[in-house]
């Protein structure tokens, strides 16, 4: 999906009002310095591409974050504010359902959500130069 036509300010507002709190809740009990940010993004569409990938694509050691509250809200926000997003994602979501694993919070998942927090922070500050 090409995130270029999304309403970035509305997505930012949805992040600040709800998604950010859910990410903090998921990470509760973890020190903010525990993980290094290794995933970066250069502009808002790129940030959303990376956020979608880390949130919804299974990775080694972290089978699925898709049923977490922050993920469901991320999906809804993208569907509302990114024209045509729902249509492009339905087939992908159905394929994912067949592979879904039981919800387990592993250290790898915590690291992945820490990366997500960094991507969202970057999304919210699009005018900052890339380090």
């Amino acid at each position: 999906y090409d995130f270029t036509n999304c309403d970035f300010e509305k997505i930012k507002a949805a992040y600040l009002s709800t998604i950010s709190k859910d990410l903090i809740t998921y990470m509760s009990g973890t020190k903010s310095t525990e993980f290094n940010n290794t995933v970066s993004c250069s502009n808002r569409p790129h940030c959303l591409t990376e956020i979608q990938s880390l949130t919804f694509n299974p990775t080694a050691g972290c089978a699925s974050l898709a049923k977490e509250m922050f993920a469901m809200k991320t999906k809804a926000a993208l569907a509302i504010w990114c024209p045509g997003y729902s249509e492009t994602q339905i087939n992908a979501t159905q394929a994912m359902k067949k592979r879904r694993k039981r919800k387990v919070t592993t250290n790898k998942c915590l690291e992945q959500v820490s990366q997500l927090q960094g991507l969202w922070r970057r999304f919210n500050r699009p005018l900052l130069k890339q380090q």
């Epitope: 036509n5 309403d7 509305k10 997505i11 930012k12 507002a13 949805a14 992040y15 600040l16 009002s17 709800t18 859910d22 509250m69 469901m72 809200k73 999906k75 809804a76 926000a77 569907a79 509302i80 504010w81 024209p83 729902s86 994602q89 339905i90 979501t93």
Partner: antibody, heavy 121, light 113 residues
């Protein structure tokens, strides 16, 4: 105060199109998203999609994709919703509703009075 | 069939307290999405009554209050008055992409006896 004045009732034949207008006053038209919601007789409201009056950008609920078109004319602070290839189950009151929140989630803070569209052969 | 389930009708005598439930699932209310309530007086457009679970827009009497727990939300009306007779609708959001993301309940008709 915020006012959304909609066009009058319409009777259409199956297969026809309808275009409903919504004239806004009492606020800066381009500052707030406009949503369209319909309500069939005896049922709950149903969201149809949004238009950003500033950019003209739109997003439609999948169910209406390909049949609905939302437009606006900023010079007269008016939003339009056109529904094509209508069927009898499109008979409903169609409302425009102005966004009210800064939370990033649609909130229907102000509603037009509604336009009854009847589809009948 | 609405995504959010409400009782078709409730009733109460003037001065009484009534509650209207709104039951969802793990993909909407249970996922932590906010719930809003609308009042629709006979023959009129809906009006925002409660937003973000328990907040009242200015002009809405404090007799109206909202709450949310788990996969359900409730609207409570105390000191029932004749002018409260109306249809009430809950609204939230859903992460199921095959339907509408903005979802409503089917409505509850409140009768003041």
């Amino acid at each position: 105060q915020v006012q959304l004045v909609q066009s009058g009732a319409e009777v259409k034949k199956p297969g026809a199109s309808v275009k409903v207008s919504c004239k806004a006053s009492g606020y800066t038209f381009t500052d707030y998203y406009m949503y369209w919601v319909r309500q069939a007789p005896g049922q709950g409201p149903e969201w149809m999609g949004w238009i950003n009056p500033n950019s003209g950008g739109t997003n439609y609920v999948q169910k209406f994709q390909g049949r609905v078109t939302m437009t606006r004319d900023t010079s007269i602070s008016t939003a339009y919703m056109e529904l094509s290839r209508m069927r009898s189950d499109d008979t409903a009151v169609y409302y425009c509703a102005r966004d009210g929140g800064s939370s990033g989630w649609p909130l229907f803070a102000y509603w037009g009075l509604g336009t009854l569209v009847t589809v009948s052969s | 069939q609405s995504v959010l389930t409400q009782p078709p009708s409730v009733s109460g005598a003037p001065g009484q307290r009534v509650t209207i439930s709104c039951t969802g699932s793990s993909s909407n209310i249970g996922a932590g999405f906010d719930v809003h309530w609308y009042q629709q007086l006979p023959g009129t457009a809906p009006k925002l009554l409660i937003y973000d679970n328990n907040n009242r827009p200015s002009g809405v009497p404090d007799r109206f209050s909202g709450s949310k727990s788990g996969t359900s939300a409730s609207l409570a009306i105390t000191g029932l008055q004749a002018e409260d007779e109306a249809d009430y609708y809950c609204q939230s959001y859903d992460s199921n992409l095959s339907g509408s993301i903005v979802v409503f309940g089917g409505g509850t008709k409140l009768t003041v006896l």
